[in-house]
């Protein structure tokens, strides 16, 4: 059974992931991003189901495509380079989902834009955090 300290750690990691995803969304979905139209042409795979931490496997598998799209954005939109930002997210995702469990991600039929993709995972983080508090 999860201890209160492990639950607290999970909550903090989720909050960190949430802030990173929100920062990326704010960094691209704004009036000062000249590449937004171009970025919205890239398609991302969405999870068929995302209700548990193991489903973060679906996010992990899309981090490389995410980095590639973020490379289009002006660096001033983020505090970190896309590579470092994605690396940080990857570390948190691996810790949250656990590396020992092998979960095959199932994707929805329809792909999504980067805005829809980020918002989906922001919603996921908020949902899990609410169950922990």
């Amino acid at each position: 059974a999860p201890t209160s300290s492990s639950t607290k750690k999970t909550q903090l990691q989720l909050e960190h992931l949430l802030l990173d995803l929100q920062m990326i969304l704010n960094g691209i979905n704004n009036y000062k991003n000249p590449k937004l139209t171009r970025m919205l042409t890239f398609k991302f795979y969405m999870p068929k189901k995302a209700t548990e931490l193991k489903h973060l496997q679906c996010l992990e598998e899309e981090l490389k495509p995410l980095e590639e799209v973020l490379n289009l954005a002006q660096s001033k939109n983020f505090h970190l380079r896309p590579r470092d930002l994605i690396s940080n997210i990857n570390v948190i995702v691996l810790e949250l989902k656990g590396s020992e469990t092998t979960f095959m991600c199932e994707y929805a039929d329809e792909t999504a834009t980067i805005v829809e993709f980020l918002n989906r995972w922001i919603t996921f983080c908020q949902s899990i955090i609410s169950t922990l508090t």
């Epitope: 969304l25 979905n29 009036y31 000249p34 805005v115």
Partner: antibody, heavy 122, light 107 residues
């Protein structure tokens, strides 16, 4: 004070063209993205189009894509909406609107013009 | 496109009443939601941005809440000047979309 004044509306036949203008004053026009929003008689609000501060991005509602073009002239502090192949369903009051932030979308639109009426009828 | 729905479509109320209007998005939009007030023959007026932040100059009797798909606009004590139509609008993805509106009428 911050002000937006639309002009160019009128009665036009289906299939014809019209160009709306929106003159901005009281703020740094060239720093802000700008929107057009319309409202058909007795109906709700419908967002039409947006243009970035520098014209680098433009987005439209599906129903006007390929027919309407949003543009701007920052040297004249003026926003435009070129409307071609007009249809009866384009009949509405057209508002230009300035965002509440020059960066964030979720600050909404805080400055609106009084609107200009476009009537498409044969 | 993200669809926005509002309920009720109209509400009859008296001065001093507490009025609650709900807005629902067809998919999660986090807090990328805005509320407007419109009176006949006038342009809309921004009330609430980012789901819960009060626009400068808007009376504190107006408040917004919610995140994700479900949002609420509350007028704590209705005043004469509040009789109008209220619209929610998502600002997450283009095309931006408005709710159909809620008309607050005199009872």
């Amino acid at each position: 004070q911050v002000q937006l004044v639309e002009s160019g509306g009128g009665v036009v036949q289906p299939g014809r063209s019209l160009r709306l203008s929106c003159a901005a004053s009281g703020f740094t026009f060239s720093s802000y993205g700008m929107h057009w929003v319309r409202q058909a008689p007795g109906k709700g609000l419908e967002w039409v189009a947006v243009i970035w501060y520098d014209g680098s991005n433009k987005f439209y509602v599906d129903s006007v894509k390929g027919r309407f073009t949003i543009s701007r002239d920052n040297s004249k502090n003026t926003l435009y909406l070129q409307m071609n192949s007009l249809r009866a369903e384009d009949t509405a009051v057209y508002y230009c609107a300035r965002p509440g932030s020059d960066y964030y979308f979720y600050y909404g639109m805080d400055v609106w013009g009084q609107g200009t009426t476009v009537t498409v009828s044969s | 496109d993200i669809q926005m729905t509002q309920s009720p479509s109209s509400v009859s109320a008296s001065v001093g009443d507490r009025v609650t209007i709900t807005c629902r998005a067809s998919q999660g939009i986090s807090n990328w939601l805005v509320w407007y007030q419109q009176k006949p023959g006038k342009p809309p007026k921004l009330l609430i941005y980012a789901a819960s932040s009060l626009q400068n100059g808007v009376p504190s009797r107006f408040s917004g809440s919610g995140s994700g798909t479900d949002f609420t606009l509350t007028i704590s004590s209705l005043q004469t000047e509040d009789f109008a139509t209220y619209y929610c609008q998502q600002a997450l993805s283009f095309p931006w979309t408005f709710g159909p509106g809620t008309k607050v009428e005199v009872k």
